[in-house]
């Protein structure tokens, strides 16, 4: 059974992931972003189901495409380099989902824009955090 300390650690990691995803969204979904129109043409795969930590496998598999789109953004728009940002997210995702269980991600039929993709994973984080508190 999860201990209160492990629950607290999970909550903190999810909060960190949530802030990173929100920060990326804030840098993209903005009228001041000169590359917004271009960025919205890229398509991302969405999870069929995202209710448990193991489903973060679906986010992990889309981190490389996410980094490629972020590389389009002007350096001015991103405090951290996209590579560093995605690397940070990857570390958190790996810790949260655990590496001992192999989960095959199932994707929805419809693809999504980067904004829809980020909003989906932000909602996921908020949802899991609310069950932990």
């Amino acid at each position: 059974a999860p201990t209160s300390s492990s629950t607290k650690k999970t909550q903190l990691q999810l909060e960190h992931l949530l802030l990173d995803l929100q920060m990326i969204l804030n840098g993209i979904n903005n009228y001041k972003n000169p590359k917004l129109t271009r960025m919205l043409t890229f398509k991302f795969y969405m999870p069929k189901k995202a209710t448990e930590l193991k489903h973060l496998q679906c986010l992990e598999e889309e981190l490389k495409p996410l980094e490629e789109v972020l590389n389009l953004a002007q350096s001015k728009n991103f405090h951290l380099r996209p590579r560093d940002l995605i690397s940070n997210i990857n570390v958190i995702v790996l810790e949260l989902k655990g590496s001992e269980t192999t989960f095959m991600c199932e994707y929805a039929d419809e693809t999504a824009t980067i904004v829809e993709f980020l909003n989906r994973w932000i909602t996921f984080c908020q949802s899991i955090i609310s069950t932990l508190t």
């Epitope: 969204l25 804030n26 979904n29 728009n77 405090h79």
Partner: antibody, heavy 121, light 111 residues
């Protein structure tokens, strides 16, 4: 002095069109992004649309998308808002506001006095 | 869209006394460029809005130093240290971290 003056408001029937103007003076208009923000009677502020300093990008609130068009003429220091298929819920005071975000982003630092649009049959 | 929620919606204050308005955003307003684009606007009766504070705590030019802004992330506050008669009006918080959204407004009136 730095000034924004809106004009073109009036009473219009639902489904009809109206074009608002915003004349800028006292500053270099061509380096500023420009917004339209509206305020329904007795209500709060609602962002409507923005256009980039050079006219290269424009964005709209969902409530006006496909009906309103923002444009600008930097040679005339003027911002426009073409409003088509007007609805009763578009009734509001329309303000133009400037914003510069390349150098020092102060947000919307100068606002016009507003022009009133009333949509009624 | 980011939802901005202000409290209180009405604030009756005594002249010379302090006033405080809170604003909460539905998500973090920290932009990837490191800035937090949270502004405060004042709208006096019959007047257009006027910028008071930008990027959380920076007073815009000509704004009296009795106005101050603070906060971080999702929680922000506008304080008026000593309310004067000319401060009567509606105050709005506004974010431009994403597409602009405003709080509902807080009416400051004299008791």
């Amino acid at each position: 002095q730095v000034q924004l003056v809106e004009s073109g408001g009036g009473v219009v029937q639902p489904g009809r069109s109206l074009r608002l103007s915003c004349a800028a003076s006292g500053f270099t208009f061509s380096i500023y992004g420009m917004h339209w923000v509206r305020q329904a009677p007795g209500k709060g502020l609602e962002w409507v649309t923005v256009i980039w300093y050079d006219g290269s990008n424009e964005y709209y609130a969902d409530s006006v998308k496909g009906r309103f068009t923002i444009s600008r003429d930097n040679s005339k220091n003027t911002l426009y808002l073409q409003m088509n298929s007007l609805r009763a819920e578009d009734t509001a005071v329309y303000y133009c506001a400037r914003e510069e975000w390349e150098l020092e982003d102060y947000g919307m630092d100068v606002w016009g006095q507003g022009t009133t649009v009333t949509v009624s049959s | 869209d980011i939802v901005m929620t202000q409290t209180p919606l009405s604030s009756p204050v005594t002249l010379g006394q302090p006033a405080s308005i809170s604003c909460r955003s539905s998500q973090s307003l920290v932009h990837s460029d490191g800035n937090t684009y949270l502004s405060w606007l004042q709208q006096r009766p019959g007047q257009p809005p006027r910028l008071l504070i930008y990027k959380i705590s920076n007073r815009f030019s000509g704004v009296p130093d009795r106005f101050s802004g603070s906060g971080a992330g999702t929680d922000f506050t506008l304080k008026i240290s000593r309310v004067e008669a000319e401060d009567v009006g509606v105050y709005y918080c506004m974010q431009t971290t994403q597409f602009p959204t405003f709080g509902q407004g807080t009416k400051v009136e004299i008791k």
